[in-house]
Interface confidence: low
Amino acid sequence: GWVWNQFFVPEEMNTTSHHVGRLRSDLDNGNNSFQYKLLGAGAGSTFIIDERTGDIYAIEKLDREERSLYILRAQVIDITTGRAVEPESEFVIKVSDINDNEPKFLDEPYEAIVPEMSPEGTLVIQVTASDADDPSSGNNARLLYSLLQGQPYFSVEPTTGVIRISSKMDRELQDEYWVIIQAKDMIGQPGALSGTTSVLIKLSDVNDNKPIFKESLYRLTVSESAPTGTSIGTIMAYDNDIGENAEMDYSIEEDDSQTFDIITNHETQEGIVILKKKVNFEHQNHYGIRAKVKNHHVDEQLMKYHTEASTTFIKIQVEDVDEPPLFLLPYYIFEIFEETPQGSFVGVVSATDPDNRKSPIRYSITRSKVFNIDDNGTITTTNSLDREISAWYNLSITATEKYNIEQISSIPVYVQVLNINDHAPEFSQYYESYVCENAGSGQVIQTISAVDRDESIEEHHFYFNLSVEDTNSSSFTIIDNQDNTAVILTNRTGFNLQEEPIFYISILIADNGIPSLTSTNTLTIHVCDCDDSGSTQTCQYQELMLSMGFKTE
């Protein structure tokens, strides 16, 4: 039968030929009568056989990682007979491993993200190298991992390639780390081959920083003319964290005056100081408020970083604005009796400069010929007033600062002219009456009424009478109707046109004023030649003729 041992050939042998082993038939007595033959893939090219001895040689450098075993067939022939001595048989040549492959990291590039401040031992990532050498052959493919760069923050488990945190890291100091891992085969023993890989480890942010004001004191100014809601300035805190962890809210911590407010601009993370109530320089020219800032989102477990909110002091200076004069009242109403003499006192208006410099005030009246005002605000008349011409005056009084004539204020002043009984009652219209020559006694000639230009305090009451002369010798009489009218009646029968064509009657009208005023009003009565029906048309004609200068017979 065949005699052979297990065949091994080391890979990567540089010698021209390497003796692998010997194939032999136990029938071979060494007299060179047997011929050995090698068949199969690799026979003659990779392996050759000494036909006489059966010695096998490798004539090529082998690479186990390319091919780890060769299956060949062996024949042995008796050269004297040409017949096979043994049946053809299959045998195996194994390529034995040498450590000719370094470990390789196949999943590069490695990148990992881990939260900053993670505790020691936190798993970051596992890196794995592979070694093409034979894992079953000694330690050629047994790897050990070590850290070349990344201390003291990271460590690597030697056998697994698991990278862990070995020291807490602060993203705000450094946000990414390049860790270099070395894998060595032969479990690190002499002759080991190594490969390295880089791992980019990025720290994700946690909210471990509270916002802190950039300044301990901010100085802002606000004009006293600023309306409520005005933004008077911004304050800013900085937070070393990023993203949502850096979002902050500003608020007022202290403002006794409750004059200001702070709103947060979430785009810029600034605090905007807002005027909540109007300020007045003359009342208070500076304010001090305290503001605080906190993160918008804080996890419960990170509260230890946010115990004391950062605060800042804000000094707000009120800027003085030259304000126009301020009248004591929004308007004034004065009264003055009519007919008072020119220069009479009407009233006093008063305006002051609200600013600290207290400029003297000059007063003026817009377009008035009736009133005057002096620098003390005293209004007087320049003419005597007649209520019956104007009972009210609507004046515009202007106050101007002496030191800044552009600072002007105006207010309305109403002057009421009070009535005095300075007008006697008089006929309400012109009366011209007619009496017929044949008129009888007691005939009504005319009803008269009166008017009084004075204002009635209660109600006008007029008293009608004939003058003393007319009462004694009058052809007419008067009856007061007690309703501010009176009737004129004939006091005799018959009148003569030729002898007395016209009567002029003096009628006294008195009012009920204090003192009472009386006027004398003349009533003209024409005597007419009337027809039987009492028509005075002839009279009218005659009168017309008379008035035109014609005489009628």
């Epitope: 020291s167 450094q174 390049w178 390295t196 880089s198």
Partner: antibody, heavy 116, light 112 residues
Framework: QVQLQESGPGLVKPSETLSLTCTVS????????WSWIRQPPGKGLEWIGY???????NYNPSLKSRVTISLDTSKNQFSLKLSSVTAADTAVYYC??????????WGQGTLVTVSS | QSVLTQPPSVSGAPGQRVTISCTGS?????????VHWYQQLPGTAPKLLIH???NRPSGVPDRFSGSKSGTSASLAITGLQAEDEADYYC???????????FGGGTRLTVLG
Amino acid sequence: QVQLQESGPGLVKPSETLSLTCTVSGGSISSYSWSWIRQPPGKGLEWIGYIYYSGSTNYNPSLKSRVTISLDTSKNQFSLKLSSVTAADTAVYYCARNWAFHFDYWGQGTLVTVSS
Amino acid sequence: QSVLTQPPSVSGAPGQRVTISCTGSSSNIGTGYDVHWYQQLPGTAPKLLIHGNSNRPSGVPDRFSGSKSGTSASLAITGLQAEDEADYYCQSYDSSLSGWVFGGGTRLTVLG
């Protein structure tokens, strides 16, 4: 404040071994990497190698065959040995602490002259 | 020959602005490793000036600033002062060498 102080002979004969020690004060040697760096007269800086507090080392490939760096945590010291020295090894030798990827604390340096 | 390339020298008058460049390759700065800058005053040990490309340690004036782009970085010094006269080194990590590397250094001379 961490301070580093190099010590060792200022003169070494050619072919002998240069030995230096760096004493760390103001902080523990356990936690960081510690490096040796040298500077030949009038020339630039050259990193020699480092030792991690766990004891693992890494050396400049150009000096690897001659360099040994060791650690004595009990004394808070680490040492450099450079064998088979020649005149080209004459330099100021600095010890330094590695912080991440840079050297944040340095010793003041010690001049070692290689001469017979 | 240094792995990171710096100009040997730069100069400027007091008050002026100067920049120092540091050029690397795809195995160091280009891979994403940070660049750090050191100032070495005559006869003293190097002192960390900028770390992580642009961060100033406390005590370093804001006249010093750093930036990084692609495979290079630069250090800018504004308002130059006489006490800024020193050697400046850039430093990074090189993955192909598995170690830290320095630039050759740049001597800054303040004129006048």
